[in-house]
């Protein structure tokens, strides 16, 4: 066969679906690789062909679209499973072609099993709610396109194993779940089970997401430098190790990049000749406020190094701050036999 533009295996699209549930999978060609959509391609006389390689096999084979009850079907650029089976797991390829053009991409599909509490190997999306922020909602994800708007599905929401009912601050409202006042105790996995009829059959969709309650923007402040501060002086003799921690607290801010860096005499450590190392550690509070510590270390400090300016800088979406460390050379303690004796006028 003639050459085909092969985009390879698109592992960025690791699709996971639950066993025995419907799944609709769009050909990734039109979403990520080509500059035209399916309708345009179809109008231009291009045909979309599907095939697959089952798990632990090398042989590409056509997809059987003649299964009972049309269990697997194709509709435009969507591959439908009604429903999936465990052994549908494998790498699927969609190929767009005519006599002069060919382009294809493969993607992995994993059919996973869930237990009675909806636990599974499924990678869960995370939805962040602001703590004590007023009413916030989550929506049952990835159910668009499964049934027409004329069909009204039934939805049941669970937190972990338990159906959400008579919860103080969590109210199911169809496809939405409302949190009146989000609290740390609302952290957890939430599952919506959507039941809908189609062509004389009943199908179920199960969608689980993780809710993480985070710091509210109402309470967010610019970075706070706890160290260095005015109370601690780093007094060293030449030859000793100089260690200065820069500890900065960052309020949680959605999509904010938190940065901490040192300057030495106004320059980044990489831009000067001193043998300096910087080690960073990060910790988070329960509401994802962040504390970053960068320890500046000079193994054998010189008297020149002790005269330099060491400044810790921090930046977030809320602002930028800086604090200089108090560094000085230790005055050597007097040696008794010489300095002290001289002081007493000994000859």
């Amino acid at each position: 066969s003639e050459r085909c533009d092969d985009w390879g295996l698109d592992t960025m699209r690791q699709i996971q679906v639950f066993e025995d549930e419907p799944a609709r999978i769009k050909c990734p060609l039109f979403e990520h690789f080509l500059k035209f959509n399916y309708s345009t391609a179809h109008s231009a006389g291009l045909t979309l062909i599907w095939y697959w390689t089952r798990q632990d096999r090398d042989l590409e084979e056509p997809i059987n679209f003649r299964l009972p009850e049309n269990r697997i079907s194709k509709e435009k650029d969507v591959l439908w499973f009604r429903p999936t089976l465990l052994n549908d797991t494998g790498n699927y390829t969609c190929m767009l072609r005519n006599t002069t053009y060919c382009s294809k991409v493969a993607f992995p599909l994993e059919v996973v099993q869930k237990d009675s509490c909806f636990n599974s190997p499924m990678k869960l999306p995370v939805h962040k709610l602001y703590i004590e922020y007023g009413i916030q909602r989550i929506t049952c994800p990835n159910v668009d396109g499964y049934f027409p708007s004329s069909v009204k599905p039934t939805i049941t929401w669970y937190m972990g194993c338990y159906k959400i009912q008579n919860f103080n601050n969590v109210i199911p409202e169809g496809m939405n779940l409302s949190f009146l006042i989000a609290l740390i105790s609302n952290n957890g996995n939430y599952t919506c089970v959507v039941t809908y009829p189609e062509n004389g059959r009943t199908f179920h969709l199960t969608r689980t997401l993780t809710v993480k309650v985070v710091g509210s923007p109402k309470n967010a402040v610019p970075p706070v430098i706890h160290s260095p501060n005015d109370h601690v002086v780093y007094e060293k003799e030449p030859g000793e190790e100089l260690l200065i921690p820069c500890t900065v607290y960052f309020s949680f801010l959605m999509d904010s990049r938190n940065e901490v860096w040192w300057t030495i005499d106004g320059k980044k450590p990489d831009d000067i000749t001193i043998d300096v190392t910087i080690n960073e550690s990060i910790s988070h509070s329960r509401t994802e406020d962040e504390t970053r510590t960068q320890i500046l270390s000079i193994k054998k400090v010189t008297s020149e190094d002790l005269k330099r300016s060491y400044v810790c800088h921090a930046r977030s979406a809320k602002g930028e701050v800086a604090k200089a460390a108090k560094v000085k050379q230790k005055v050597p303690a007097p040696r008794y036999t010489v300095e002290l004796a001289c002081g007493f006028g000994a000859t």
């Epitope: 089976l85 869930k114 237990d115 909806f118 009912q165 089970v193 199960t206």
Partner: antibody, heavy 119, light 107 residues
Framework: QVQLQQSGAELARPGASVKFSCKAS????????MQWVKQRPGQGLEWIGT????????RYTQKFKGKATLTADKSSSTAYMQLSGLASEDSAVYYC????????????WGAGTTVTVSS | DIKMTQSPSSMYASLGERVTITCKAS??????LSWFLQKPGKSPKTLIY???RLVDGVPSRFSGGGSGQDYSLTISSLEYEDLGIYYC?????????FGSGTKLEIK
């Protein structure tokens, strides 16, 4: 299509145990709950309990704890109910029924197994 | 446990007549209610789930409704095959509980 095939009638002595089955076909056995229901002659329906074959998790009504034991064999897609310490009031038809999470907890029913306890 | 009170316990109706059966829960069951029909010597058949959703294949003359503690099943025009015993079931919380049944007979 979805079918639940229940085992045949059982005759047992008081104090004995019986174990009967419900074989599922036409769907993924491990993805649905299996409900069990009791019906005494001329009486109404009484929920006994449920099992999720995917992980063996069970729930029982208080009255049947210690009386009924629900199990499932994934390899044969079969659910079982064992009744122990049989007494005359255990004489009944026992139904299995398939159900999903949340919305549709009973959809397809088995034909029932008749248990008669007699000395 | 949630108690389900079904009424009437039995009723007579003519073919073509509109029939309504009710079920009252001892507490709010949040529309987690199903209706079943059992014909003599047969296993029950599920008609309705989540209070008002018709199971696939069930004739459209059956409808369900209600919320909170009060629910109903209506047959818009009674047919001979609709005769039997109707049960409601709450599945809002464990243990699930059935109503005591309504026997529907021909007048």
């Amino acid at each position: 299509q979805v079918q639940l095939q229940q085992s045949g009638a059982e005759l047992a002595r008081p104090g004995a145990s019986v174990k009967f089955s419900c074989k599922a076909s036409g769907y993924t056995f491990t993805s649905y709950w299996m409900q069990w229901v009791k019906q005494r002659p001329g009486q109404g329906l009484e929920w006994i309990g449920t099992i999720y074959p995917g992980d063996g998790n069970t729930r029982y009504t208080q009255k049947f704890k210690g009386k009924a034991t629900l199990t499932a064999d994934k390899s044969s897609s079969t659910a079982y109910m064992q009744l122990s310490g049989l007494a005359s009031e255990d004489s009944a038809v026992y139904y299995c029924a398939r159900g999903y999470f949340g919305n549709l907890v009973f959809d397809v029913w088995g034909a029932g197994t008749t248990v008669t306890v007699s000395s | 446990d949630i108690k389900m009170t079904q009424s009437p316990s039995s009723m007579y109706a003519s073919l073509g007549e509109r029939v309504t059966i009710t079920c009252k829960a001892s507490q709010d069951i949040n529309t987690y209610l199903s209706w079943f029909l059992q014909k003599p010597g047969k296993s029950p058949k599920t008609l309705i789930y989540r209070a008002d959703r018709l199971v696939d294949g069930v004739p459209s003359r059956f409808s369900g409704g209600g919320s909170g503690q009060d629910y109903s099943l209506t047959i818009s025009s009674l047919e001979y095959e609709d005769l039997g015993i109707y049960y409601c079931l709450q599945y809002d919380e464990f243990p699930y509980t059935f109503g005591s049944g309504t026997k529907l007979e021909i007048k």
